[in-house]
Interface confidence: medium
């Protein structure tokens, strides 16, 4: 017989398939799409989330001026290859044999071109800034009060390292996170910024990815923090390259 | 560092129960399983089953299903096990056994507690 | 359940010499995932079992070399190199391939 662990979910990923049939009978969940087996006792990877929800059914400035080089995810939702790590393919292709080059977030970072473009490495994205204008309220809240509640979040919700966040700033009413990770930085276990933010950006809009709990409730204070727009920058260690007709247009 | 303090020494009547408590610091105690294996005098070492604090989930061995209850409390990451309906024979020292359950597991229990007597007498 | 079968029951040994520990299992300990989940453990006298090996071979931390794990499928072995007095103790090999048990355990002592 088999010790078959009940109430067989996992409890960071909705987007998965569970039963006993690990070791002993402990729970087992495998992503959506792409069938991995993954780690419920952490967040899962946005390449690995990004292939399930392809899967399944259709439904005197203090803020950061993001540099010339910051990316922005204009292209969408598409069908990512990961790695057996689920981490993205530097190349990715659709199915009509057009390729791009992205970054370890799944961004695109060069022209489009086609099965002979090369993607030599997949080039680490180390800085995130998370821009978001909330509704407005009676008043400001307190920056560092929010400051605390921000990271509090990212720490206990997401996972994420104190130290990765580098930075909240705040001039009602824009909000900016900013998360900063080099390679050097990450350490074995540690959750990737990357995926923390993207964990964040479906909590603001309301599509949970955690299994079972409430969408996320943000107050500073006991007054509720509600998020009107949000924009994602993302920096990579290399600079994207794409050709000077897109940086023109 | 991790640790594993768990509750002292108890003394029962055949037909009581038992609860031990284990609380855990120096780790995340949502993150890895807790198991619970006893010794009784002289003897070998007996899994009793294990839970994952993160949703509670649990998982018993048959001996045990019936007269065993494994919960947690995540605000103070202390783990519990109770033992209903003691008899003569379910003395022993119970430990708790943190297991490793993150990526790559090995599901090994690397930390134990140091171990409650629980003597069942009349 | 699966049955974990140790031998010996008792083994004196002399300080600097090695020791080995076999333990049987009574079905294969390979997990449909690849994996051997065998673990060995030590239970030093009045002390708490701890971890010395996990996964058949892997020495967990602050564990010494002279300790080292081997074996697949039904047969393992735990080998003490140059055994020290601070060796003593009951030796348990565990599996959680399947619904976890232990072995019946070894004790080690100094001759």
């Known amino acids: 017989h088999t010790a078959a662990q009940d109430n067989c979910t996992c409890p960071t990923n909705k987007m998965t398939v569970c039963s006993p049939d690990g070791p002993g009978g402990r729970c087992q969940c495998r992503a959506l799409g792409s069938g991995m087996a993954v780690d419920c006792s952490t967040l899962t990877s946005k390449c690995l989330l990004l292939k399930a929800r392809m899967s399944a059914p259709k439904n005197a400035r203090t803020l950061v001026r993001p540099s010339e080089h910051a990316l922005v995810d204009n292209d969408g939702l598409y069908d990512p290859d990961c790695d057996p790590e689920g981490r993205f393919k530097a190349r990715q292709c659709n199915q009509t044999s057009v390729c791009w080059c992205v970054n370890s977030v799944g961004v695109r970072r060069t022209d489009k071109g086609d099965l002979s473009l090369r993607c030599d490495e997949l080039v680490r994205t180390h800085h995130i800034l998370i821009d978001l204008r909330h509704r407005p309220t009676a008043g400001a809240f307190n920056h560092s009060d929010l400051d605390a509640e921000l990271r509090r979040l990212f720490r206990e919700r997401y996972r994420l390292h104190p130290k990765f966040v580098a930075a909240v700033h705040y001039e009602q009413p824009t909000i900016q996170i900013e998360l900063r990770q080099n390679t050097s930085q990450k350490a074995a276990g540690d959750v990737d910024i990357g995926d923390a933010a993207y964990y964040f950006e479906r909590d603001i809009k309301g599509e949970s990815l955690f299994q079972g709990r409430g969408g996320l409730d943000l107050r500073v204070r006991g007054e509720p923090l509600q998020v009107e727009r949000t924009l994602i920058y993302y920096l990579d260690e290399i600079p994207p390259k794409f050709s000077m007709k897109r940086l023109t247009a | 560092q991790v640790q594993l303090v768990q509750s002292g020494a108890e003394v029962k009547k055949p037909g009581a129960s038992v609860k031990v408590s284990c609380k855990a610091s120096?780790?995340?105690?949502?993150?890895?399983?807790m198991h619970w294996v006893r010794q009784a005098p002289g003897q070998g070492l007996e899994w009793i089953g294990y839970?994952?604090?993160?949703?509670?989930?649990?998982g018993y061995n048959q001996r045990f299903k019936s007269r065993a209850t494994m919960t947690v409390d995540k605000s103070t990451s202390t783990a519990y096990m109770e033992l209903r309906s003691l008899r003569s024979d379910d003395t022993a020292v119970y430990y708790c056994?943190?297991?490793?359950?993150?990526?790559?597991?090995?599901?090994?229990?690397?930390?134990w507690g140091q171990g409650t007597m629980v003597t069942v007498s009349s | 359940d699966i049955v974990m079968t140790q031998s010996p029951l008792s083994l004196p040994v002399t300080p600097g010499e090695p020791a080995s520990i076999s333990c049987r299992s009574s079905?294969?300990?390979?997990?449909?995932?690849?994996?051997?989940?065998l673990h060995w453990y030590l239970q030093k006298p009045g002390q708490s079992p701890q971890l010395l090996i996990y996964?058949?071979?892997n020495r967990f931390s602050g564990v010494p070399d002279r300790f080292s794990g081997s074996g697949s499928g039904t047969d393992f072995t735990l080998k003490i190199s140059r055994v020290e007095a601070e060796d003593v103790g009951v030796y348990y090999c565990?599996?959680?391939?399947?619904?976890?048990?232990f072995g019946g355990g070894t004790k080690v002592e100094i001759k």
């Open positions: 996964k058949v071979s």
């Open positions: 079905q294969s300990l390979v997990h449909g995932n690849g994996n051997t989940y």
């Open positions: 839970i994952y604090p993160y949703n509670g989930g649990t």
């Open positions: 120096g780790y995340t105690f949502t993150d890895y399983n």
């Open positions: 056994a943190r297991e490793d359950y993150g990526s790559s597991p090995s599901y090994a229990m690397d930390y």
């Open positions: 565990s599996q959680t391939t399947h619904v976890p048990t």
